[in-house]
């Protein structure tokens, strides 16, 4: 004969568990019905009734099988540093991300409670660790013979170009200025001259070498002076 | 459902310590409170201590307050049992069962239980 099929509340065999979507109601001392996500228990088991479930009011959520007497409050709305990653319904909390260019300072249960900006390396400083989801943008001092002249939270430090004759070498913040040494052209008086760098760049991934090219016919000398070498900025 | 897995349990001094660990999977473990049971062979199964849904507030059974210590690691989805000075009479095996939202320890029913760990306090 086939095993009886027992229904909810019924009392479990002594050692044994209930069974999936049932729990063990420790009043009653039977297995109980929980109620399925986007509900609640309006009624808790006894042992000759089973639990009875009613809908989460808006606002409120149950993601679980369950049988909380209330449904839980749906988290505040996102604040104007976040994005709504997932709405409030019935089943789900809302869950509030950090907008780009801001990471999660305080994490909570899903989602971020406090978002902060990526911090931004000055000019003589890159970034040594890109900024995550949950971390800090690293700045870190240019080493000699590299620089960086933004103020950002993804440039690193770039090499200085490679001159055959250097015009105004370069510094931290700066990148080095050449000038050239064959006469291909006549020019007007006091032009500098900026060949093309051995190396090309990238704003954000370490640069690969290219052969020397053709010197250029002009360029131009950065404006003013160069900034203080300060690590970030909260700007 | 979240699935349970218990481990950490031997054979022990008395005097010693223990500590157990309560893995969950299927999933997060935050959402829940969680208990640990022991049961010692030929008795009912008792609830040693809790540890509530937001981690706010913990429970232990007279016979262990003092010398055991609840505690959850909720990135690495785990529940742990630290025991001191342990005595014969903690001889059982210790069980980890859950409650979703579970707001007040004890717990108010019981939802998955792992296959326990036995624990063995003997000279």
């Known amino acids: 004969l086939p095993a009886q099929v027992a229904f909810t509340p019924y009392a479990p065999e002594p050692g044994s568990t209930c069974r999936l979507r049932e729990y063990y109601d420790q009043t009653a001392q039977m297995c109980c019905s929980k109620c399925s996500p986007g509900q609640h228990a309006k009624v808790f088991c006894t042992k000759t009734s089973d639990t009875v479930c009613d809908s989460c009011e808006d606002s409120t959520y149950t993601q679980l099988w369950n049988w909380v007497p209330e449904c839980l409050s749906c988290g505040s709305r996102c604040s104007s540093d976040q994005v709504e990653t997932q709405a409030c319904t019935r089943e789900q909390n809302r869950i509030c991300t950090c907008r780009p260019g801001w990471y999660c300072a305080l994490s909570k249960q899903e989602g971020c409670r406090l978002c902060a900006p990526l911090r931004k390396c000055r000019p003589g400083f890159g970034v040594a660790r890109p900024g995550t989801e949950t971390s800090d943008v690293v700045c870190k001092p240019c080493a000699p013979g590299t620089f960086s002249n933004t103020t950002s939270s993804t440039d690193i430090c770039r090499p200085h170009q490679i001159c055959n004759v250097v015009a105004i070498p370069g510094n931290a913040s700066m990148d080095a200025v050449c000038t050239s040494t064959s006469p291909t052209r006549s020019m007007a008086p006091g032009a500098v001259h900026l060949p093309q760098p051995v190396s090309t760049r990238s704003q954000h991934t370490q640069p690969t070498p290219e052969p020397s090219t053709a010197p250029s016919t002009s360029f131009l000398l950065p404006m003013g002076p160069s900034p203080p070498a300060e690590g970030s900025t909260g700007d | 459902e979240v699935q349970l897995v218990e481990s950490g349990g031997g054979l022990v001094q008395p005097g010693g310590s223990l500590r157990l660990s309560c893995a969950a999977s299927?999933?997060?473990?935050?959402?829940?409170?969680v208990a640990w049971f022991r049961q010692a062979p030929g008795k009912e199964r008792e609830e040693v201590s809790c540890i509530t849904y937001s981690g706010g507030s913990t429970n232990y059974a007279e016979s262990v307050k003092g010398r055991f210590t609840i505690s959850r690691d909720n990135s690495k989805n785990t529940l742990y049992l630290q025991m001191n000075s342990l005595r014969a009479e903690d001889t059982a095996v210790y069980y980890c069962?859950?409650?979703?939202?579970?707001?007040?320890?004890?717990?108010?029913?019981?939802?998955?239980w792992g296959q326990g760990t036995l624990v063995t306090v003997s000279s």
């Open positions: 299927g999933s997060r473990l935050d959402y829940y409170a």
């Open positions: 069962t859950t409650e979703p939202y579970g707001s007040s320890c004890p717990l108010s029913g019981y939802d998955t």
